[in-house]
Amino acid sequence: KKVVLGKKGDTVELTCNASQKKNTQFHWKNSNQIKILGIQGLFLTKGPSKLSDRADSRKSLWDQGCFSMIIKNLKIEDSDTYICEVENKKEEVELLVFGLTANSDTHLLEGQSLTLTLESPPGSSPSVKCRSPGGKNIQGGRTISVPQLERQDSGTWTCTVSQDQKTVEFKIDIVVLAFQKASSTVYKKEGEQVEFSFPLAFTLEKLTGSGELWWQAERASSSKSWITFDLKNKEVSVKRVTQDPKLQMGKKLPLHLTLPQALPQYAGSGNLTLALEAKTGKLHQEVNLVVMRATQFQENLTCEVWGPTSPKLTLSLKLENKGATVSKQAKAVWVLNPEAGMWQCLLSDSGQVLLESNIKVVPTW
């Protein structure tokens, strides 16, 4: 017998063909021999089965000897062996209906787990293979679990259910609620204005929640809240700002913070957390601030950086248009009795300049 796989909620067409291409009598019955539909004269008649209100046939194809049965809004319990009786012959079609659904909301926070559950008819032994938008393949039986969602898991997941060498494909749209970046570092000279931006990696029509930027300054013994805010239908309103520094926040998305000036005492790491309506848990983005200061005091020219820098970064003091350079993989460099001229302090990573500050050394007479 023929096997047909169907998807819960979809429509399936079970075909039945007569050898003669003409309108003739036919009946569709289920395995309990209960009539579902058939032809009487020129009219479609329906039997007492549970399918009667969802079953139909293409009348336009009857005179071509095609007596298919269409079942709309498929249910798992529609799985059965259906018998088509035409021209004194019986054709059996086994219909297996499957459903694949996410156990929870399909809008999930980064780091949360996604579980896909397969609904299948009794006696079936299907296998499921899912492919994420990023190309990750996951296999399973009745359930498929993705323990920790990543932002690249956002998009359409394609899942293939296989049974008796037949397949049916499901598409599930998953939205991973996360910031576009897990972490970002801002490099600034002392006194410059600092802009922090926290773009989201998703769009929702209605976005309501609240958040906080929690900051650990390198020079401080403990961390503290820099700003708290609410988000109502994508409009940002500040709740509380620390007195020092006096941060400013944009009123619209993306979340945007301005620090009037970069100072060594502000250098450090922050964590912006955002709680969203109807979600358990919070979105996080780490942000780092590195501040550079170049100073001349008496016969000493010093360049310092504060904040989270990796040990492989190089700090250099260099006299413009001259070869004089001092470099260190450290957070401070200095030159004693520097030559007069324009000196550059450079923070670089494998030759790429991340931060630069110029200081003019005047000749001492």
Partner: antibody
Framework: EVQLVESGGGLVQPGGSLRLSCVAS????????MSWVRQAPGKGLEWVAN????????YYVDSVKGRFTICRDNAKNSLYLQMNSLRAEDTAVYYC????????????WGQGTLVTVSS | DIQMTQSPSSVSASVGDRVTINCRAS??????LAWYQQKPGKAPNLLIF???SLQSGVPSRFSGSGFGTDFSLTITTLQPEDFATYHC?????????FGQGTKVEIK
């Protein structure tokens, strides 16, 4: 180690005054909002008042407005609650707490000082 | 003022039980909710902030959830040291307000 130590509680007659003090240590006091919270015997917690880092903003629960004044002296790492026109219903253990937790939570509390208003 | 209503007012449970305490705000408070534990004669101790984040040093058997008006605190496997009174508190708008407290007692 963060520490908050309250003092100044005691027995006072209705209509009388009392000044509670809270001395903070182990953190930069001038960087945090501070609160007073009270708890009447056998009852729940009731937030009384709080003040901004520099003392410029102050908020009170309605039942104490006009009678209680919260203030701070950052040079002395101290928080105060001046309580005037005391009533029997002000009888409670008064706690000083730091609003230093994430999401505006009260992360450190003192041991409390008992204020009894009775004739 | 925002009223905070805790339920139940007391709960009798045994060591190993799962206990859930609810807290309802009279108006939406987003995630501006904290949970505190208080033992007799002691000051309250912060457990949960921002409705669902665990304070550093607090055992992972404690968890919080909710947003807007309905919140809950769950202790998955009750330990002997968890018998105490639990308070919820909103920090959405002044005056800050607390629930009336829920006493977790030994059955």
């Amino acid at each position: 180690e963060v520490q908050l130590v309250e003092s100044g509680g005691g027995l006072v007659q209705p209509g009388g005054s009392l000044r509670l003090s809270c001395v903070a240590s182990g953190f930069t006091f001038s960087s945090y909002w501070m609160s007073w919270v009270r708890q009447a015997p056998g009852k729940g917690l009731e937030w009384v008042a709080n003040t901004k880092e520099d003392g410029s903003d102050k908020y009170y629960v309605d039942s104490v407005k006009g009678r209680f004044t919260i203030c701070r002296d950052n040079a002395k790492n101290s928080l105060y609650l001046q309580m005037n026109s005391l009533r029997a219903e002000d009888t409670a253990v008064y706690y000083c707490a730091r609003e230093g937790g994430q999401w505006l939570a009260l992360d450190y509390w003192g041991q409390g000082t008992l204020v009894t208003v009775s004739s | 003022d925002i009223q905070m209503t805790q339920s139940p007012s007391s709960v009798s449970a045994s060591v190993g039980d799962r206990v859930t305490i609810n807290c309802r705000a009279s108006q939406g408070i987003s995630s501006w909710l904290a949970w505190y534990q208080q033992k007799p004669g002691k000051a309250p101790n912060l457990l949960i902030f921002g409705a669902s984040s665990l304070q550093s040093g607090v055992p992972s058997r404690f968890s919080g959830s909710g947003f807007g008006t309905d919140f809950s605190l769950t202790i998955t496997t009750l330990q002997p040291e968890d018998f105490a009174t639990y308070h919820c508190q909103q920090a959405n708008s002044f005056p800050w307000t607390f629930g009336q407290g829920t006493k977790v007692e030994i059955k």
